[in-house]
């Protein structure tokens, strides 16, 4: 049995980000059982978690993970040095910043140590798997009688992120949302002074430095409106 499985994972580019290969075997045995898919996410380019569903194994198995970078100076095979566990069984590996090379093709190999021929290899484009921390320090400035400007910070290079701002009043049933580019600034031109507004922001590593599809968590919300804006008409930043 010799299989190559191409599986879309939401990060496809002109070439597949990801493929699985199962080693050929002579007869049907444990070694023909597919290994779980490894999912990796790079958190704020500070560390990376590569995890798999350990409960998909027919019996509890401490799978091992090796990795390397294809066609690069970092192509030496590395062993996972920091395993993550689920119920005392390996279920992931955490790599630190110095082990992350965002713009080189990351190759990750999962193996059953009891059946060394039972292994699966995936290739990942890490620049498509970055998730930044949530935006911080939201502030509101009143630019004019009816215009508000929302600013925020990210613990990240500004020009690498795009943002999504959501806002609503206490009278609204749903959020209004607006995309914002790397300039991380949002203006609301027409504000009703009789209403209380809530704003929140999330960010994504796209499009100038990577093509990640996953957004950060939402920021803490910030409020502006009827019962607060009288205190300081020019600057007010109240976090929930």
């Amino acid at each position: 049995l010799n299989t190559t499985i191409l599986t879309p994972n939401g990060n496809e580019d002109t070439t597949a980000d990801f493929f699985l290969t199962t080693m050929p075997t002579d007869s049907l045995s444990v070694s023909t059982l597919p290994l779980p898919e490894v999912q990796c996410f790079v958190f704020n380019v500070e560390y990376m978690n590569c995890t798999w569903n350990s409960s998909s194994e027919p019996q509890p198995t401490n799978l091992t993970l090796h990795y390397w970078y294809k066609n690069s100076d970092n192509d030496k095979v590395q062993k996972c040095s920091h395993y993550l566990f689920s119920e005392e069984i390996t279920s992931g590996c955490q790599l630190q910043k110095k082990e992350i090379h965002l713009y080189q093709t990351f190759v990750v190999q999962l193996q059953d140590p009891r059946e060394p021929r039972r292994q699966a290899t995936q290739m990942l484009k890490l620049q498509n798997l970055v998730i930044p921390w949530a935006p911080e320090n939201l502030t509101l400035h009143k630019l004019s009688e009816s215009q508000l400007e929302l600013n925020w910070n990210n613990r990240f290079l500004n020009h690498c992120l795009e943002h999504l701002v959501q806002y609503r009043t206490d009278w609204d049933h749903s959020w209004t949302e607006q995309s914002v580019d790397y300039r991380h600034k949002f203006s609301l031109p027409s504000v009703d002074g009789q209403k209380r507004y809530t704003f929140r922001v999330r960010s994504r590593f796209n499009p100038l430095c990577g093509s990640a599809q996953h957004w950060s968590e939402w920021s803490h919300p910030i409020h502006w409106g009827s019962n607060t804006s009288k205190e300081n008409p020019f600057l007010f930043a109240l976090e929930a």
């Epitope: 704020n44 380019v45 500070e46 100076d73 090379h101 965002l102 713009y103 080189q104 620049q127 930044p132 613990r155 990240f156 290079l157 020009h159 690498c160 430095c209 990577g210």
Partner: nanobody, 116 residues
């Protein structure tokens, strides 16, 4: 700390070309993102072009098709080839180096003047 030195600015007539160069003090392989920005008096610095560690490039709409960002890892240089220059391209051009997640370094800038 990464030091960046730009060169190649100068005066050119509309329709002409210039090539800006940027020499970082660190090896390019240790820098994730290199970019060019520009600034005109009284305005905010604006992004022009970016090249990432896998040689993916991006351009601001007004320069697409006219400007090309590239890098030469052997010479440890980053370039901005500017063709079909317009008076609106007159600005101080800055080289930028980014090391993720948030280290950022700037050159001193080089002046580009496009006029007849």
């Amino acid at each position: 700390e990464v030091q960046l030195v730009e060169s190649g600015g100068g005066w050119v007539q509309p329709g002409g070309s210039l090539r800006l160069s940027c020499s970082p003090s660190e090896r390019l392989s240790s820098i994730d993102i290199m970019g060019w920005y520009r600034q005109t008096p009284g305005k905010e610095r604006e992004w022009v072009a970016t090249i990432t560690g896998d040689d993916t490039t991006h351009y601001e709409n007004s320069v697409k098709g006219r400007f090309t960002i590239s890098r030469d890892t052997a010479k440890n240089m980053v370039y901005l080839q500017m063709n079909s220059l317009e008076p609106e391209d007159t600005a101080v051009y800055y080289c930028n180096a980014g090391i993720l997640p948030r280290e950022e370094y700037w050159g001193q800038g080089t002046l580009v003047t496009v006029s007849s």
